[in-house]
Each structure stands twice: as C-alpha cells, then as structure tokens.
Amino acid sequence: EPPTACREKQYLINSQCCSLCQPGQKLVSDCTEFTETECLPCGESEFLDTWNRETHCHQHKYCDPNLGLRVQQKGTSETDTICTCEEGWHCTSEACESCVLHRSCSPGFGVKQIATGVSDTICEPCPVGFFSNVSSAFEKCHPWTSCETKDLVVQQAGTNKTDVVCGPQDRLR
C-alpha cells in the first residue's frame, strides 16, 4: 500500500517517499522506484537554507551601497548575505533593508536622549499626564494642558498620544 506520510527530510510524490535536497542544494528530479532524488548545488550568489524540494535557489541579498548598506556577513550556499549599515547609521528593521541616521520616537513616546554620533535616539513612553502626538527625533513628551488654570474643565481626558480637551464650566442658574 502506498504511503500517506513520509519520514523527516522526505516528501511524498507519486505515492512515493523521496529524500529532500539538503541545504545548499536544489531539486533537479524527483526520485523514482529505481533512482534517488537528484539534487544540484546552488550556484555562486545563491542559497537554500533548509531541507527542500525547490527547483530554484534563492539569490543572495544585495547590500546596496546607495542605501547605505554594506555586507556584514557574506552568504554561502546555505545562508543568505547579512547586510548592515555604514558606520553611524542604523538599520530600519531586523532585515536591514535600508538605513536611517537615527530613529525617531513614535506618537505616545518622547525623546529621552537625542542621538549622538555613537548612540541612537533613546525614546521613553509618555507617563500619565504627558503626551506626544508626533514622530520626532527631538521632542519630549508634553504635559497635558491644565484646564483649571484657564478656568475651564476637562471635557475629554488626555492619553499618551493626545492632549486633554478643555471646555467651559457648566454654570448653575
């Protein structure tokens, strides 16, 4: 009876369990009753990082110097190239696909320390009573408006991203 599942590092094809290709190799032809799976090494600047049945290897990532990127670790047939940013610049994400001089603090966060040549911007969450409604690389959290000092009352509570809304006091007749 033909198998319905295969062992680890195998795949099911034509009611048969074939060996997957090892990392660094791509599939050329599936196994048959009489032959093993045929695999070929990935070419220069290509890779596959898992046991696979891919017919094409992936291209190594290009670290584009026009985006401020440079190679941190050269790719192999089993690993992708790892990019990093030029000195003094910071990756915009873990994948490091582009570079920023320094990060900004999102709404709800204020700048605790402005970036320097050696350190990135340090952000801090706005505590109760303070807010930031902008992305900024220099603005701190701002205190909520004090309605009382303007002889007004709070009509809408503030948050870490919004100021309070003040309004006139209800006059009792």
Partner: nanobody, 116 residues
Amino acid sequence: EVQLLESGGGLVQPGGSLRLSCAASGFTFAGYEMWWFRQAPGKGLERVSAINPQGTRTYYADSVMGRFTISRDNSKNTLYLQMNSLRAEDTAVYYCAKLPFMFDDRGQGTLVTVSS
C-alpha cells in the same frame, strides 16, 4: 523622489554671518520635522538643529545655541539656518534632512568655511 538642495555656504571671516537655505521637493514638506546636520573634514555627522513641522518648536546643539537660528517657510517648501558669530570650528559641509533620515534622502550639502 525626495530632493533636498542646500545653498548659501561660502567663505566667511570669524564673527561673520551666513544664511543657509534648503529647498525641498518630492514630499509634503509641511508635514515633516526637519534637521540641519554638519560634517567637518575627517569627522562624523553632527546634529546641529531641528524644527517641528509647524515651526513652533526647535532644538539646538549646545555648540550652536544662541548663535544659530533655524526656521522654515512651509509656503515655499524651504528650510533655513541663520548662522551668526561664526567660529573656525563651524567649518563643515552642512546638510538638511527630513525625518526619518534615510541614507538615500541626503542632499549634496553646502560648504561653510570660517577663516581669516
């Protein structure tokens, strides 16, 4: 495509003044925090000054506080840096930048040389 074109640099004597301009295009200028940076020969980028989108809040590095004034004209999509009481240590290429400061958004800069 973001374009930032700095101008107004030149040779000036110590104690003199210059006004730098940065003409912006390719983005909604009035919606962005803007910065001036500078890079002296053989040194890293130094943060000089910043201004919020509305032009109501500013930041100055200690080294230029009281001497430099940042401003913007959102109707002209232009950022300015008025530099007074210039010193030899202000000699650098000055760049403007928008938030976030993407590597490929940089302008060419304008050279300021303070020398007698």
